[in-house]
């Protein structure tokens, strides 16, 4: 699997999409997990509804939500109020029994909010939305890492 990079702005919401073959993964629950180290395990963050037929219902764990379009074949993960510690490697997974198939490998990059460096005195800042439904989702910038490309090049 290639790794797809999704970039979001600190404090905003980032939407990650994982397309898959809906028939190949028919009847399968999905999950979003965080990769712990290069060879480490992938730690489950959130998974879709226990009843596959209800996978379209949004489930959340803290600031992360997941929903699955099982007919269209798109798993969507929303990371709300993105923070620097959210940056890292993740996976979208398809679950069966104790096995997990990787649908997509994802690198989340968190960009500094360009507004942070201005005088915010005259700016209207909306109150933080209480629900995912009301949250503003910034369209993410995504690209695939080229083969051999280092995600975080060493700084000189």
């Amino acid at each position: 699997h290639n790794t797809t990079v999704f970039q979001g702005v600190e404090g905003q919401s980032l939407q990650v999409s994982c397309p898959y073959d809906s028939m190949k993964h028919w009847g399968r629950r999905k999950a979003w997990c965080r990769q712990l180290g290069e060879k480490g395990p992938c730690q489950r963050v959130v998974s879709t509804h226990n009843l596959w037929l209800l996978s379209f219902l949004r489930r959340r764990n803290g600031s992360t939500a997941i929903t699955d379009d099982t007919l269209g074949g798109t798993l969507t993960i929303t990371l709300r109020n993105l923070q620097p510690h959210d940056a890292g490697f993740y996976q979208c997974q398809s679950l069966h029994g104790s096995e997990a198939d990787t649908l997509r490998k994802v690198l989340v990059e968190v960009l500094a909010d360009p507004l942070d460096h201005r005088d915010a005195g005259d700016l209207w800042v909306p109150g933080e939305s209480e629900s995912f439904e009301d949250a503003h989702v910034e369209h993410s910038i995504s690209r695939s890492l080229l083969e051999g490309e280092i995600p975080f090049p060493p700084t000189s």
């Epitope: 190949k24 399968r28 029994g97 096995e99």
Partner: antibody, heavy 121, light 107 residues
Framework: EVQLVQSGAEVKKPGESLMISCKGS????????IGWVRQMPGKGLEWMGI????????RYSPSFQGQVTISADKSISTAYLQWSSLKASDTAMYFC??????????????WGQGTLVTVSS | EIVMTQSPATLSVSPGERATLSCRAS??????LAWFQQKPGQAPRLLIY???TRATGIPARFSVSGSGTEFTLTISSLQSEDFAVYYC?????????FGPGTKVDIK
């Protein structure tokens, strides 16, 4: 009507190569996994591996990894099981089966009639 | 790899009687268990999947109880066409594994 039709019986010598086939009809061949199961004479069933013809994603049971190759040609709705160098211990009946996935569990719901492979010098 | 064991190896039953077949897994397979029937010279036939769901066309005399590591297939009243070998299959963990089978023959 869903059908899996396998190629005919084969008699081979040790060291020879072989490819047997399993042709699906009556359903969308690219939308279901196809598994291969071995049954040695007078013995039980052994899971060999599985392929998803839609994208040729293939998984092998560790016991069969490197011993056989599973492939599929979706243009003719056919899955294959092949050996590059047969051994006498490969003598067995080989079945292909369709795996149907669903909310209540997975099921090998349709099976081919089996292909008997005999390897003898 | 999960090891499946079946008991007894052979079960001798008279037609009309009840047959009880056991399948045990070396670790939990949740409800990811199927049962197959195989007659001599034929391909296996799916009976039960998802631990307890009967496949299309399978009569109600076939039922399964249990989940996790212990499962029981019960044939409430054996008919002549039920004398065969029965296999359980787990596909909770890779690779999927079959039990060695239970032969049900006529007493």
């Amino acid at each position: 009507e869903v059908q899996l039709v396998q190629s005919g019986a084969e008699v081979k010598k040790p060291g020879e190569s072989l490819m047997i086939s399993c042709k699906g009809s009556g359903y969308s061949f690219t939308s279901y996994w196809i598994g291969w199961v071995r049954q040695m004479p007078g013995k039980g069933l052994e899971w060999m591996g599985i392929i998803y013809p839609g994208d040729s994603d293939t998984r092998y049971s560790p016991s069969f990894q490197g011993q056989v190759t599973i492939s599929a040609d979706k243009s003719i709705s056919t899955a294959y099981l092949q050996w590059s160098s047969l051994k006498a211990s490969d003598t067995a009946m080989y079945f292909c089966a369709r795996r149907r996935q669903g909310i209540w569990g997975d099921a090998l719901d349709f099976w081919g009639q089996g292909t008997l492979v005999t390897v003898s010098s | 790899e999960i090891v499946m064991t079946q008991s007894p190896a052979t079960l001798s039953v008279s037609p009309g009687e009840r047959a009880t077949l056991s399948c045990r897994a070396s670790q939990s397979v949740s409800s990811n268990l199927a049962w197959f029937q195989q007659k001599p010279g034929q391909a296996p036939r799916l009976l039960i999947y998802g631990a307890s769901t009967r496949a299309t066309g399978i009569p109600a005399r076939f039922s399964v109880s249990g989940s996790g590591t212990e499962f029981t297939l019960t044939i409430s009243s054996l008919q002549s066409e039920d004398f065969a070998v029965y296999y359980c299959l787990q596909d909770n963990n890779w690779p999927p594994t079959f039990g060695p089978g239970t032969k049900v023959d006529i007493k």
